[in-house]
Interface confidence: medium
């Protein structure tokens, strides 16, 4: 089963792909932003400042809610998918 925990983080101006990595590996921070201001992609808070927010899970941005959810891996829960269930 997949557990989805909702948190909200601000959209940022990075154009990396959505964060879907299995944590706790951490991505390196991106380079300078704002260089390609024409045709900028919609901001995704799963990138840049909050790219590592979901510890054991996948970051999903729900734009109309201005919300970020952490889709937790099995056995993990909590706001950042940081807690392991003892089942």
């Amino acid at each position: 089963s997949v557990r989805v925990e909702q948190v909200v983080k601000p959209p940022q101006n990075k154009t990396e792909s959505e964060n879907t990595s299995d944590k706790p590996k951490r991505k390196k921070k991106g380079g300078k932003n704002g260089k390609n201001r024409r045709n900028r992609k919609k901001k995704n808070p799963c990138n840049a400042e909050f790219q590592n927010f979901c510890i054991h899970g996948e970051c999903k941005y729900i734009e109309h809610l201005e919300a970020v959810t952490c889709k937790c891996q099995q056995e993990y829960f909590g706001e950042r998918c940081g807690e392991k269930s003892m089942k």
Partner: antibody
Framework: EIQLQQSGPELVKPGASVKVSCKAS????????MYWVKQSHGKSLEWIGY????????GYSQKFKGKATLTVDKSSSTAYMHLNSLTSEDSAVYYC????????????WGQGTTLTVSS | DIKMTQSPSSMYASLGERVTITCKAS??????LSWFQQKPGKSPKTLIY???RLVDGVPSRFSGSGSGQDYSLTISSLEYEDMGIYYC?????????FGGGTKLEIK
């Protein structure tokens, strides 16, 4: 009750360094990024950077890279800002601020720490 | 860095008066703008986020508007407790940048 309690005023000599603390209470410290802001006397605010307390990952404004170092101690729910090679230009009030999650805005601020650099 | 130009830098207004403060960004900031109020010797307090969303507990006489590069904060009917310095902040792009502030005083 959520609080951000900053360390007291500092008077230091040029060339020295200082560490300002911001102790969080009343919430899950590692779930909210902490931000630092500088306010020089009678002037506007400047964004120094932020830190993700879970990983200890900081992000800095280019202007403050090499000047400020942001760290956290998860065990005491405390964020720190270390400022080095101090000059009179660093004299200011420094604030820590938490960013809320839903909705996301700067919802809690520390009371500010006054730093005076003078010989 | 995105430059935020705030105006006026200071102003006097009478109680009950409608007050408007403006902030212009050097580029489109996609409504990622907050307004803060700061009283002497105190920490800033967020009034508005995402250009027009009122923070819980902030009086409804405060409102924000704007898009693209141009934004404004309006106080519909000035009260004595509203005096202080007001700042805008863009959080569209790193580094976040503040406007220079508007000092609001009572006539």
């Amino acid at each position: 009750e959520i609080q951000l309690q900053q360390s007291g005023p500092e008077l230091v000599k040029p060339g020295a360094s200082v560490k300002v603390s911001c102790k969080a209470s009343g919430y899950a410290f590692t779930n909210y990024n902490m931000y630092w802001v500088k306010q020089s006397h009678g002037k506007s605010l400047e964004w120094i950077g932020y830190i993700d307390p879970y990983y200890g990952d900081p992000g800095y404004s280019q202007k403050f890279k090499g000047k400020a170092t942001l760290t956290v101690d998860k065990s005491s729910s405390t964020a720190y800002m270390h400022l080095n090679s101090l000059t009179s230009e660093d004299s200011a009030v420094y604030y820590c601020a938490r960013r809320g999650n839903f909705p996301y805005y700067f919802d809690y601020w520390g009371q500010g720490t006054t730093l005076t650099v003078s010989s | 860095d995105i430059k935020m130009t705030q105006s006026p830098s200071s102003m006097y207004a009478s109680l009950g008066e409608r007050v408007t403060i403006t902030c212009k960004a050097s580029q489109d900031i996609n409504s990622y703008l907050s307004w803060f109020q700061q009283k002497p010797g105190k920490s800033p307090k967020t009034l508005i986020y995402r250009a027009n969303r009122l923070v819980d507990g902030v009086p409804s006489r405060f409102s924000g508007s704007g898009s693209g590069q141009d934004y404004s904060l309006t106080i519909s009917s000035l009260e004595y407790e509203d005096m202080g310095i007001y700042y805008c902040l863009q959080y569209d792009e790193f580094p976040y940048t503040f406007g220079g502030g508007t000092k609001l005083e009572i006539k």
